[in-house]
Amino acid sequence: HTAAQDNCTCPTNKMTVCSPDGPGGRCQCRALGSGMAVDCSTLTSKCLLLKARMSAPKNARTLVRPSEHALVDNDGLYDPDCDPEGRFKARQCNQTSVCWCVNSVGVRRTDKGDLSLRCDELVRTHHILIDLRHRPTAGAFNHSDLDAELRRLFRERYRLHPKFVAAVHYEQPTIQIELRQNTSQKAAGDVDIGDAAYYFERDIKGESLFQGRGGLDLRVRGEPLQVERTLIYYLDEIPPKFSMKRLTA
């Protein structure tokens, strides 16, 4: 009989500590950093993943033009505050009491302020545009094959319901994947587009979050799809609030 530990891992999140000490010997996994229990049958929330990452030792076929309100994650990594469900708290602060408001994917959507800053609600990111540039290939990929392969990837690897992949655009060498998910569309148990996009981003960078699975091997009709640049734009249900200084910078 194999040891319980051999079977007690989290397939969807390698940044966990698992032990078979749950009810009835159930494998129970907790995210590094937060110690929160995670559901290993689905993707872990981006907030818990970022927290775990910060706790780990340091080592039409026309392309879419992002809206003027689209956010790009320029701030990079930070150690976020997550709520009991693992979602980002609307207000984030650092150790020096600098605070800012974030959206549901943890991207800053206001100017930075002090502890008096109020963030009344967590604003939902309902539209994500993943902008990729692939490495040169002998010829362009067939658009419908590329579309099918990327939809399959989001459905099978990230368990995102197909209805949330709104479109796949392609103008060699640029690929754009549009994810859309309004609050009203997201049912209990549905993977969040923000979480799916984060897992995809980490996969593309060769930093897979999945336990023991090989890295992402994207192929279109057997031809490897190698990404050399990724940009992700986030659109919120309520436009962000930045001062003019930032907008004109």
Epitope: H1, A3, A4, Q5, N7, S19, P20, D21, G22, P23, G24, G25, R26, C27
Partner: antibody, heavy 116, light 107 residues
Framework: QVQLVQSGAEVKKPGSSVKVSCKAS????????INWVRQAPGQGLEWMGQ????????HYNQKFQGRATLTADKSTNTAYMELSSLRSEDTAVYYC?????????WGQGTLVTVSS | DIQMTQSPSSLSASVGDRVTITCKAS??????LSWYQQKPGKAPKSLIY???RLVDGVPSRFSGSGSGTDFTLTISSLQPEDFATYYC?????????FGGGTKVEIK
Amino acid sequence: QVQLVQSGAEVKKPGSSVKVSCKASGYRFTDYVINWVRQAPGQGLEWMGQIYPGSDSFHYNQKFQGRATLTADKSTNTAYMELSSLRSEDTAVYYCARFFEGLAYWGQGTLVTVSS
Amino acid sequence: DIQMTQSPSSLSASVGDRVTITCKASQGINNYLSWYQQKPGKAPKSLIYRANRLVDGVPSRFSGSGSGTDFTLTISSLQPEDFATYYCLQYDEFPLTFGGGTKVEIK
């Protein structure tokens, strides 16, 4: 193969304590939880508590909290269940069971009779 | 605590019959349900875990199904050695709770 061998039958007086042992073999003791379940004569199964020898973490059924104590001796691969302040309604067969994901291997049971 | 209501509490059947035992949880238990068989004077024996997974060595005439709050143990063709008491157990959360048991007797 997995084996859980429990200590022999006991007859106890009301108000006293009993300590039932459960010696495990055939697997790594610290890798699996041990649960304790009892069964009064002619009745169903009742869960008492769970101990994980790997970290000495435990959970008790509220009904037995304060009266039951679960321990594990890693040096002898033995789990223990001690029940204090015994009353006649504690007369039952006490089972230890190794659990993983709901799948259980059971000891043969220990009959504890509480009688004045 | 999660209550597990098992039915029927007893049933009479003949060898070869198809037997169905049900277990209803007072709230959703995410398929964390197992089934046990117990014969008089013996310790229980695991049959099914995670609602529908058959334990190694258990005959394929035993099967488990259901999800959410309603679960079923089916014996497709009752054999003489299957006359026993059957219990369900939820292990979705502490405290673990058993159903009241179903005694399967010879008709």
